[in-house]
Interface confidence: low
């Protein structure tokens, strides 16, 4: 049967969802085992003009020493104010100095990046050493690049659409996810449902999605269910500031007992089906309904506190 629940965007103060993901619009990861220089290329699009960006490079040490130097090629389409963290990494940075400003002196070797189109930038970078990773990101707020992590099967990095960068790169989009809500018609009471639907990614390896849930309610005020639906290879690590009913696909565990895995359920994989699930669990209100690309960390901040949500 059709569930009558007209999902509408909720007021921005009712709920906000931010997330970190390895999914990129275009990208590649390759192995360059014997290279002395590890080359990474980032094409960053900022559709909204001047932006701030936090870029962290993290080294995974092999045999206690950092094995090679790193060249990071940064190609941006508009002004960016960069907060770079690359502690102890022998980094060479190639960028357009008229577009990139550093929050503090970078303390690394820098090279002016020629004004080339993307394909030529890749060629220019490849001349300096085999490219380990390349990615195109749209409006990132923060990026974590893990060095020495490349586990690609490719020996040559060629940008391909809709890629999963695995552990090599994680990023957080500037724009929070769209949060919608609705009233489930004909259900009494004040129980609220928070529904998070993680869409299948471009790589089907086992994944743990950490879900941080912060609800601004006094503990006694809340009767809630958290419904987490994702592809079969996704398990969940839940970090919540309230006790609530948990209803998930796959397996889940709590951050306070990470080793204790609890088996989930087979849940519908359509919005309508998930609304039906919320109704079956006696929720009278869907306080937040969010669909996201495959993410590694999802943070939900909500303040609906049991049956008081109103949508437009």
């Amino acid at each position: 049967e059709t569930v009558h629940c007209d999902l509408q965007p909720v007021g921005p103060e009712r709920g906000e969802v931010t997330y970190t993901t390895s999914q990129v619009s275009k990208g590649c990861v390759a192995q360059a085992p014997n290279a002395i220089l590890e080359v990474h290329v980032l094409f960053l699009e900022f559709p909204t003009g001047p932006s701030q960006l936090e870029l962290t490079l993290q080294a995974s040490k092999q045999n206690g020493t950092w094995p090679r130097e790193v060249l990071l090629v940064l190609s941006v389409n508009s002004s960016v104010f960069l907060h770079l963290q690359a502690l102890g990494i022998p980094l060479h940075l190639a960028y357009n100095s008229s577009l990139v400003t550093f929050q503090e002196p970078p303390g690394v070797n820098t090279t002016e990046l020629p004004s080339f189109p993307k394909t030529q930038i890749l060629e220019w970078a490849a001349e300096r050493g085999p490219i380990t990773s390349a990615a195109e990101l749209n409006d990132p707020q923060s990026i974590l690049l893990r060095l020495g992590q490349a586990q690609g099967s490719l020996s040559f990095c060629m940008l391909e659409a809709s890629q999963d960068m695995g552990r090599t790169l994680e990023w957080r989009p500037r724009t929070p996810a769209l949060v919608r809500g609705c009233h489930l018609e004909g259900v009494a009471g004040h129980k609220e449902a928070h529904i998070l639907r993680v869409l299948p990614g471009h790589s089907a390896g086992p994944r743990t999605v950490t879900v941080k849930v912060e609800l601004s309610c006094a503990p006694g005020d809340l009767d809630a269910v958290l419904i987490l639906q994702g592809p079969p290879y996704v398990s969940w690590l839940i970090d919540a500031n309230h006790n609530m009913q948990i209803w998930t696909t796959g397996e889940y565990s709590f951050k306070i007992f990470p080793e204790k895995n609890i088996r989930g359920f087979k849940l519908p994989d359509t919005p309508q089906g998930l609304l039906g699930e919320a109704r079956m669990l006696n929720a009278s209100i869907v306080a937040s309904f969010v669909e996201l690309p495959l993410a590694s960390i999802v943070s939900l901040h909500a303040s609906s506190c049991g049956g008081r949500l109103q949508t437009s």
Partner: antibody
């Protein structure tokens, strides 16, 4: 410095139309959620309409009192917000403010007066 | 819709007095924002997210409250504080403003 400058107000007969514009500068316009808020003479503030950013699919929202008569739109390439007002009524007489929403209305234009009178 | 009722609607006070404006919501809201408006001028953001002072707002202003009841307090009124103050919520659609409180010189 953020600047919002409204224009297009004036005297119009009931049933008539008017198009307000708001020129924005000093911030990344395409990233902003933009609203129109009005204030009838001697009265309080009333939210009219909102258009969200490109990232939010330029979703639009309207107060019940103007739904079906007013249309909010934007041209990100020109950094301009618009309010097309049709089937105007005498109760639409007000100063119309263009505002930017960032957790609250953090920037306001100086306003443009719309008078609906026969 | 959530109605916001401000009280008093007008308040006469002297320089140096303490002034308190209340905004009551018809349903619980997450945050309340406040704006100051002077005659013939556009409103200015004054207090956001219930208790945070907007840029340039003097520390004699403070905001507090939760749920349905919120207050704006001026610890010691100064001549430039005489104006109209509006509360506003957007925890639920549609966004609504209070009717305003006019702070006048006694």
């Amino acid at each position: 410095e953020v600047q919002l400058v409204e224009s297009g107000g004036g005297l119009v007969k009931p049933g008539g139309s008017l198009r307000l514009s708001c020129a924005a500068s000093g911030f990344t316009f395409s990233d902003a959620w933009m609203d129109w808020v009005r204030q009838a003479p001697g009265k309080g503030l009333e939210w009219v309409a909102e258009i969200r950013s490109k990232a939010s699919n330029h979703a639009t929202y309207y107060a019940e009192s103007v739904k079906g008569r007013f249309t909010i739109s934007r041209d990100d390439s020109k950094n301009t917000l618009y309010l097309q007002m049709n089937s105007l009524k005498t109760e639409d007489t007000a100063v119309y403010y263009c505002t930017r929403w960032r957790r609250f209305f953090d920037s306001w234009g100086q306003g443009t007066l719309v008078t609906v009178s026969s | 819709d959530i109605q916001l009722t401000q009280s008093p609607s007008s308040l006469s006070a002297s320089v140096g007095d303490r002034a308190t404006i209340t905004c009551r919501a018809s349903s619980s809201v997450s945050y309340m924002h406040w704006y100051q408006q002077k005659p013939g001028k556009a409103p200015k953001p004054w207090i956001y997210a219930s208790s945070n002072l907007a840029s340039g707002v003097p520390s004699r202003f403070s905001g507090s409250g939760s749920g349905t009841d919120y207050t704006l307090t001026i610890s010691s009124l100064q001549p430039e504080d005489f104006a109209t103050y509006y509360c506003q919520q957007w925890s639920s659609n549609p966004l609504t403003f209070g009717g305003g409180t006019k702070v006048e010189i006694k």
